[in-house]
């Protein structure tokens, strides 16, 4: 790391080290030999999240409901607003600038992981012994019915999309 001319939380200006403004404040004027750095708090709906020498604060992110967004965490003078998506939707990126509808898992597939505000549904194929006969964003693969426990026999084998069909056992005469 190259040497620096100033302490941490300072910056070099006119061959002198001045204090940076603390998070939540912006720079109004640099220090001089006789005066300290002048900083001012960010206004409503503005923020700065680091020690800085910015002359303007950043605007809080707007969670646009037209894009399916809502406020997850309100911004402060030191933090940006955090957006998330409405129920049934998830963010298209880490920055969460827009939302898309959660995908549903097709018949033959079950939900491995239910979608959140930031991640989509994860589907998995139903393994042997399991099935899913619906398109759903919540339903897992269900196990085939156990005919034996009902004193019945399998009349029709199950698939990944259908349950087994049970029927009565043939009685010996």
């Amino acid at each position: 790391e190259p040497p620096t001319a100033c302490r941490e939380k300072q910056y070099l200006i006119n061959s002198q080290c001045c204090s940076l403004c603390q998070p939540g404040q912006k720079l109004v004027s640099d220090c001089t030999e006789f005066t300290e750095t002048e900083c001012l708090p960010c206004g409503e709906s503005e923020f700065l999240d680091t020690w800085n020498r910015e002359t303007h604060c950043h605007q809080h992110k707007y969670c646009d409901p037209n894009l399916g967004l809502r406020v997850q965490q309100k911004g402060t003078s030191e933090t940006d607003t955090i957006c998330t998506c409405e129920e049934g939707w998830h963010c298209t990126s880490e920055a969460c600038e827009s939302c898309v509808l959660h995908r549903s898992c097709s018949p033959g597939f079950g939900v491995k992981q239910i979608a959140t505000g930031v991640s989509d549904t994860i589907c998995e194929p139903c393994p042997v012994g399991f099935f899913s006969n619906v398109s759903s964003a919540f339903e897992k693969c269900h196990p085939w019915t156990s005919c034996e426990t009902k004193d019945l026999v399998v009349q029709q084998a199950g698939t990944n999309k259908t349950d087994v069909v049970c029927g009565p056992q043939d009685r010996l005469r």
Epitope: C6, R7, Q10, Q16, C17
Partner: antibody, heavy 126, light 108 residues
Framework: QVQLVQSGAEVKKPGASVKVSCKAS????????MHWVRQAPGQGLEWMGW????????NYAQKFQGRVTMTRDTSISTAYMELNRLRSDDTAVYYC???????????????????WGQGTLVTVSS | DIQMTQSPSSVSASVGDRVTITCRAS??????LAWYQQKIPGKAPNLLI????TLQSGVPSRFSGSGSGTDFTLTISSLQPEDFATYYC?????????FGGGTKVEIK
């Protein structure tokens, strides 16, 4: 009362490394930068760099860049200075020195040393 | 780097004399200057003055400092036997910190 107690004298061969310790007591260790200054025999004072014990941040003089490492162990209030690839002209007394409190300084770096360690003589000789 | 040039490099004086040491910075350093006294080479220096003119706690008032920008002065108004030592200036404007070459005050 404030005290900085350094490790004992060392004799090293050229190319070797030395690690000097500086144990602080009598004040909040993490509240003040710690600097290292050396003085070769018959010479003046030479600043080597600083460590912020609170953050672990460091700043080294260009001359020592790549050869010096300053570290700290806050659990025992001790700062360390390690110098590698020693040469005969590294023979000197090495001092740790306490700076002004963090937040004291608003303009300038205002690094003035009110407390010093007793010094550690490092002799580099083949 | 900011070069600090001290003059004279040595001065012979008697007890009771007024002694003046100067320090010049290669560029303006505002008032960010300190003076140290080192009685024995290899023993730690003592901080006398900081921000060019502020006397460090416990330092006798016969020591004073002045100057701003590039030119600074350390004055000992009436030299005492314990003042025979080497004096260093140090700029504290920006890193790297730099020291003057020292001024040795010797007994005449």
């Amino acid at each position: 009362q404030v005290q900085l107690v350094q490790s004992g004298a060392e004799v090293k061969k050229p190319g070797a490394s030395v690690k000097v310790s500086c144990k602080a007591s009598g004040y909040t260790f993490t509240g003040y930068y710690m600097h290292w200054v050396r003085q070769a025999p018959g010479q003046g004072l030479e600043w080597m760099g600083w460590i912020n014990p609170d953050s672990g941040g460091t700043n080294y003089a260009q001359k020592f860049q790549g050869r010096v490492t300053m570290t700290r162990d806050t659990s025992i209030s001790t700062a360390y200075m390690e110098l590698n690839r020693l040469r005969s002209d590294d023979t000197a007394v090495y001092y740790c020195a306490r700076d002004q409190p963090l937040g004291y300084c608003t303009n300038g770096v205002c690094s003035y040393f009110d407390y010093w360690g007793q010094g550690t003589l490092v002799t580099v000789s083949s | 780097d900011i070069q600090m040039t001290q003059s004279p490099s040595s001065v012979s004086a008697s007890v009771g004399d007024r002694v003046t040491i100067t320090c010049r910075a290669s560029q303006g350093i505002y008032s960010w200057l300190a003076w140290y006294q080192q009685k024995i080479p290899g023993k730690a220096p003592n901080l006398l003055i900081y921000t060019a003119s502020t006397l460090q706690s416990g330092v006798p008032s016969r020591f004073s400092g002045s100057g701003s920008g590039t030119d600074f002065t350390l004055t000992i108004s009436s030299l005492q036997p314990e003042d025979f030592a080497t004096y260093y200036c140090q700029q504290a404007n920006i890193f790297p910190l730099t020291f003057g070459g020292g001024t040795k005050v010797e007994i005449k």
